[in-house]
């Protein structure tokens, strides 16, 4: 069986401030079992945007419906998109674990540039 | 409900350090990101700093840059704000805020912790 | 850096008077703007995010308005325990996070 892929087909994202932007993941397997989560940036610093498990995150809805039985599309829109939200978006696959799940594989990233807001 | 319970204020001599202690509980602490911001005698609000949901990312405002140190340890819900060569400027009431999600407002405060740098 | 302004810095009405406080920014912070609420010895207390939106268990009275550089808080018919500090918070460029200078919201 081939070892799951985290896909991110687009490189980069370009939305004006105020509006949403939509960034696209998909997974090849259901296998292993785990949450997936957003980052922005990469390495320590990397800014939690999304966490399928836990959390309220309020700007950041899902495309389609994660819970569904099956489901391999995990694809998030941000709203309300700011100057300080630019940068690059990763989907994350993590695999369950005790106490705490572990990171399995990351997307290739996806850059989001804002521009100004048309006046 | 979200509560956020500074401790470690009190009274200290200029240069000497102090350590305090924002222990939160009722939300999922880990996904949020967390700051220290805070209140001197008769003045308005000055963000201190900032440390993202991981615990990697951090930042600060000058006036405190290079001596203070902002931390997090999410396996005990705790943010800690490590402060060194106090001055008599430094003397405020200190509040951990917590973000509503990482670009964004601080939507719940705690009540606050006094120090006072005084020779 | 964005500076928030705030005015005026003391309001002083009567009990089921209009109060507005006005928060201007010196660049575009869209609508990424907060008010808080202070009372005499107590913690800050978020009442209004997003320019306009109320936030969990505020009162109706309480309402903003704005977008840009130029916003409102308005208390509609201001109550005795209304009487605080009353600061706005920009969070559309950081860091650092902005905070204006407070008005004061006496209740005669």
């Known amino acids: 069986e081939d070892e799951l892929q985290v896909i991110q087909p687009e490189k980069s994202v370009s939305v004006a401030a105020g509006e949403s932007a939509t960034l696209r993941c998909a997974m090849t397997s259901l296998i292993p079992v785990g949450p997936i989560m957003w980052f922005r940036g990469a390495g320590a610093g990397r800014e939690l945007i999304y966490n399928q498990k836990e959390g309220h995150f309020p700007r950041v809805t899902t495309v389609s419906e994660l819970t569904k039985r099956n489901n391999l599309d995990f694809s998030i829109s941000i709203s309300n998109i700011t100057p300080a939200d630019a940068g690059t978006y990763y989907c994350v696959k993590f695999r369950k674990g005790s106490p705490d799940d572990v990171e399995f594989k990351s997307g290739a990233g996806t850059e989001l540039s804002v521009r100004a807001k048309p006046s | 409900d979200v509560q956020l319970v500074e401790s470690g204020g009190g009274v200290v001599r200029p240069g000497e350090s102090l350590r305090l202690s924002c222990a939160a509980s009722g939300f999922s602490f880990r996904s949020y990101a967390m700051n220290w911001v805070r209140q001197a005698p008769g003045e308005g609000l000055e963000w201190v700093s900032r440390i993202n949901s991981g615990g990697g990312g951090t930042d600060y405002a000058d006036s405190v840059k290079g001596r203070f140190t902002i931390s997090r340890d999410n396996s005990k819900n705790t943010l800690y704000l490590q402060m060194n060569s106090l001055r008599a400027e430094d003397t405020a009431v200190y509040y951990c805020?917590?973000?509503?999600?990482?670009?964004?407002?601080?939507?719940?405060w705690g009540l606050g912790a006094l120090v006072t740098v005084s020779s | 850096e964005t500076v928030l302004t705030q005015s005026p810095a003391t309001l002083s009405v009567s009990p089921g008077e209009r109060a507005t406080l006005s928060c201007r920014a010196s660049?575009?912070?869209?609508?990424?703007l907060a008010w808080h609420q202070q009372k005499p010895g107590q913690a800050p207390r978020l009442l209004i995010y997003?320019?306009?939106n109320r936030a969990t268990g505020i009162p109706d009275r309480f309402s903003g308005s704005g977008s840009g550089t130029d916003f409102t808080l308005t208390i509609s018919s201001p109550q005795t325990e209304d009487s605080a500090v009353y600061y706005c918070q920009q969070y559309y460029y950081w860091p650092p996070y902005r905070f204006g200078g407070g008005t004061k919201v006496e209740i005669k």
């Open positions: 660049q575009t912070v869209g609508s990424k």
């Open positions: 805020a917590k973000q509503y999600d990482w670009n964004s407002f601080f939507d719940y």
């Open positions: 997003d320019a306009s």
